[in-house]
């Protein structure tokens, strides 16, 4: 009984949401990120920005699910192009924006 | 709490056939990836097969490539294991595991594993 | 096919700090996995990502992979660390585990 692959974008979603719902002090110290353009390749992005976040346990596992949807290996200090030049965020907005965009991709039925 | 319960284990002889189920509780079964991994009596461990959530694609070693099925049934939370033509070599104890989430699912890492059953092929 | 190789055996002292290498071709272009297992237990992860713990395991366990070598180390190794480990890499549409290493802590 194959499912359909929203369930596995449901189960990040969900992660982003308790993330943004149980913040109560500043998510990761207020650690700042680069920002992504989230038109294409957005997975692998957003790991690539993360990934640079340590010893924030909040996020931790929204790292971990993210890997599951980039193919290749993320590094730290690793850029994309798709990085937004020279504009960096803090974590807390930058999980609200990647929130926002993968709940339309959710509803636009845009698993890859 | 994740837990994962194998059965189906046991004493078969060479040629014969064993189905093992694995039953998953505690997470959202359907979106995960799941596998499963043998270890033979003294020795490593090995992996057997895939079954990815996010798609339909099933992965196998060459070790049991045409001999051994994987499959799962979702409305059960159930992975189950089809053994045909069980060799000796195939005597060990078998684990289901809890892989990962999304498209590449191997990226992840295997977090949960199951107390595994048994298989035991002599005549 | 692909294979890991680990040294079938390592040995330490209490307190001391136990590394287990896994060789493998270009290993550090893909993610390490590293497994504890007790004997009659199933394994643990205890790294994953190369270097990262998930909740639970004690910060002693450390992990790196770079080159063709992904290392797992134990710092201030304890009896309780007495276990065979094994390392575990994905390629080509394949899960291959290392050969593992039996640690005794003398």
């Known amino acids: 009984s194959p499912v359909p692959p929203s369930t596995a974008l449901k189960e990040l979603i969900e992660e982003l949401v308790n993330i943004t719902q149980n913040q109560k002090a500043p998510l990761c110290n207020g650690s700042m990120v680069w920002s992504i353009n989230l038109t294409a390749g957005v997975y692998c992005a957003a790991l690539e920005s993360l990934i640079n976040v340590s010893g924030c346990s909040a996020i931790e596992k929204t790292q971990r699910m993210l890997n599951g949807f980039c193919p290749h290996k993320v590094s730290a200090g690793q850029f994309s192009s798709l990085r937004v030049r020279d504009t960096k965020i803090e974590v807390a907005q930058f999980v609200k924006d990647l929130l926002v965009h993968l709940k339309k991709l959710f509803r636009e039925g845009q698993f890859n | 709490e994740v837990q994962l319960l194998e059965s189906g284990g046991g004493l078969v002889q060479p040629g014969g056939s064993l189905r093992l189920s694995c039953a998953a509780s505690?997470?959202?079964?359907?979106?995960?990836?799941m596998s499963w991994v043998r270890q033979a009596p003294g020795k490593g461990l090995e992996w057997v097969s895939a079954?990815?959530?996010?798609?339909?694609?099933?992965y196998y070693a060459d070790s049991v490539k045409g001999r051994f099925t994987i499959s799962r049934d979702n409305s059960k939370n159930t992975l189950y294991l089809q053994m045909n033509s069980l060799r000796a070599e195939d005597t060990a104890v078998y684990y289901c595991?809890?892989?990962?989430?999304?498209?590449?699912?191997?990226?992840?890492?295997?977090?949960?594993w199951g107390q595994g059953t048994t298989v035991t092929v002599s005549s | 096919s692909y294979e890991l190789t680990q040294p079938p055996s390592v040995s330490v002292s209490p307190g001391q700090t136990a590394s287990i290498t896994c060789s493998g071709d270009?290993?550090?272009?893909?993610?390490a996995c590293w497994f504890q297992q007790k004997p009659g237990q199933s394994p643990v992860l205890v790294i994953y990502?190369?270097?990262k713990r998930p909740s639970g395991i004690p910060e002693r366990f450390s992990g790196s992979n770079s080159g063709d070598t992904a290392t797992l180390t134990i710092s201030g190794t304890q009896a309780m660390d007495e276990a065979d480990y094994y390392c575990?890499?994905?390629?080509?549409?394949?899960?291959?585990f290392g050969t593992g290493t039996k640690v005794t802590v003398l």
């Open positions: 270009k290993l550090g272009d893909k993610y």
């Open positions: 079954f990815s959530g996010w798609d339909v694609s099933t």
């Open positions: 575990q890499a994905w390629d080509s549409s394949t899960y291959v």
């Open positions: 990502h190369d270097s």
């Open positions: 505690g997470f959202t079964f359907s979106s995960y990836a």
């Open positions: 595991v809890q892989d990962g989430l999304g498209p590449y699912f191997y990226n992840y890492g295997m977090d949960v």
